[in-house]
Interface confidence: low
Amino acid sequence: QGGTRSPRCDCAGDFHKKIGLFCCRGCPAGHYLKAPCTEPCGNSTCLVCPQDTFLAWENHHNSECARCQACDEQASQVALENCSAVADTRCGCKPGWFVECQVSQCVSSSPFYCQPCLDCGALHRHTRLLCSRRDTDCGTCLPGFYEHGDGCVSCPTSTLGSCPERCAAVCGWRQ
């Protein structure tokens, strides 16, 4: 039959596109295209992505899989989810560390490095908000400590000298 071929594929289902001469069924996620179909509405030859490579979407044209990313050890990143045939490695920060983005318009694919969370206990402070999107949020001084300058200082145990208000339970009141 003469004339130009219509770009629309008259095949059952909607997962067909013109590849080469014919409308072919595409490859599922996790597979790459080895060869297009050899008859109208036929199946393409698809192969599973090799180890350490992936393809996240159904496709009609990818003849190779994408290489899985390696988490940046220099940036203290760890793999939260290992790479599979259908998904890239998901890099993040280990417990006790938080994500510090390296770019301004930050999205999930933006480069980042991991920073250690502030240890409120080591600063003798209550933990008000656990470290997640940003650093730990430390609160007031723990019992037995009082605010002095920027830090928490251990309450005096002796009743000699002054006794800060927050330390009344430790060193008692003096007139």
Epitope: V107, S110, F112
Partner: antibody, heavy 121, light 115 residues
Framework: EVQLVESGGGLSQPGNSLQLSCEAS????????LNWVRQAPGKGLEWVAY????????SYADAVRGRFTISRDNAKNSLFLQMNNLKSEDTAMYYC??????????????WGQGTQVTVSS | QPVLTQSPSASASLSGSVKLTCTLS???????IVWYQQRPDKAPKYVMY???????SKGDGIPDRFSGSSSGAHRYLSISNVQSEDDATYFC?????????????FGSGTKVTVL
């Protein structure tokens, strides 16, 4: 188009209160951290307060801590700054400014046009 | 918290070029900063972020005439082929987390006059 529109400014006496509002549109409000930044006449920019996307983390500048309260209503796409015990040094243009979404990034990528607060007896 | 130092003024001839400097306190020379442009009686506008390695990303609608670079604790904003609309005050700013508290500091601003 991202828009931030401040309101609620005006003339107030020392010791009085004002509440500023910032209405947001053109982006998913609940995904973004927000800040108030002020600018006294002829002076530079001074950060005032910060609130995280779900109000879980709030921070204030030393100059306003204990007097100002930042809050937000994600259902109404609104940011607020309750200003109590106003002082003459609070006189400034007040801007709301958006933090980009996602992780602990430091940027203020969109600003409102500002609302003027004047504290005078 | 970081301290950002800017010179108060700079001038540039029309179609010429100008380079603005923002200097971080030395112990925080690795900090990323942000440049803002504020035209008279207008709100600040995001120009770009600028990392310690000189990489940067500009905001929407910022012309190619604007570029950033870094050297040690210094962060630079360069404007080439200066236009009359570049007449503005340029602030650098840096966000930080200190003892669990998030905040911002800004430089005092550099007023650029286009001659």
């Amino acid at each position: 188009e991202v828009q931030l529109v401040e309101s609620g400014g005006g003339l107030s006496q020392p010791g009085n209160s004002l509440q500023l509002s910032c209405e947001a549109s053109g982006f998913t409000f609940s995904n973004h951290d927000l800040n108030w930044v002020r600018q006294a006449p002829g002076k530079g920019l001074e950060w005032v307060a910060y609130i995280s996307s779900a109000s879980g983390l709030i921070s204030y500048a030393d100059a306003v801590r204990g007097r100002f309260t930042i809050s937000r209503d994600n259902a109404k796409n609104s940011l607020f700054l309750q200003m109590n015990n106003l002082k003459s040094e609070d006189t400034a243009m007040y801007y709301c400014a958006r933090d980009p979404a996602y992780t602990g990034l430091y940027a203020l990528d969109f600003w409102g046009q500002g609302t003027q607060v004047t504290v005078s007896s | 918290q970081p301290v950002l130092t800017q010179s108060p003024s700079a001038s540039a001839s029309l179609s010429g070029s100008v380079k603005l400097t923002c200097t971080l306190s030395s112990e925080l020379s690795w900090y990323t900063i942000v440049w803002y442009q504020q035209r008279p009686d207008k709100a600040p506008k995001y120009v770009m972020y600028l990392k310690s390695d000189g990489s940067h990303s500009k905001g929407d609608g910022i012309p190619d005439r604007f570029s950033g670079s870094s050297s040690g604790a210094h962060r630079y904003l360069s404007i080439s082929n200066v236009q009359s609309e570049d007449d503005a005050t340029y602030f650098c700013g840096a966000g930080y987390t200190l003892a669990g508290q998030y905040g911002w500091v800004f430089g005092s601003g550099t007023k650029v006059t286009v001659l």
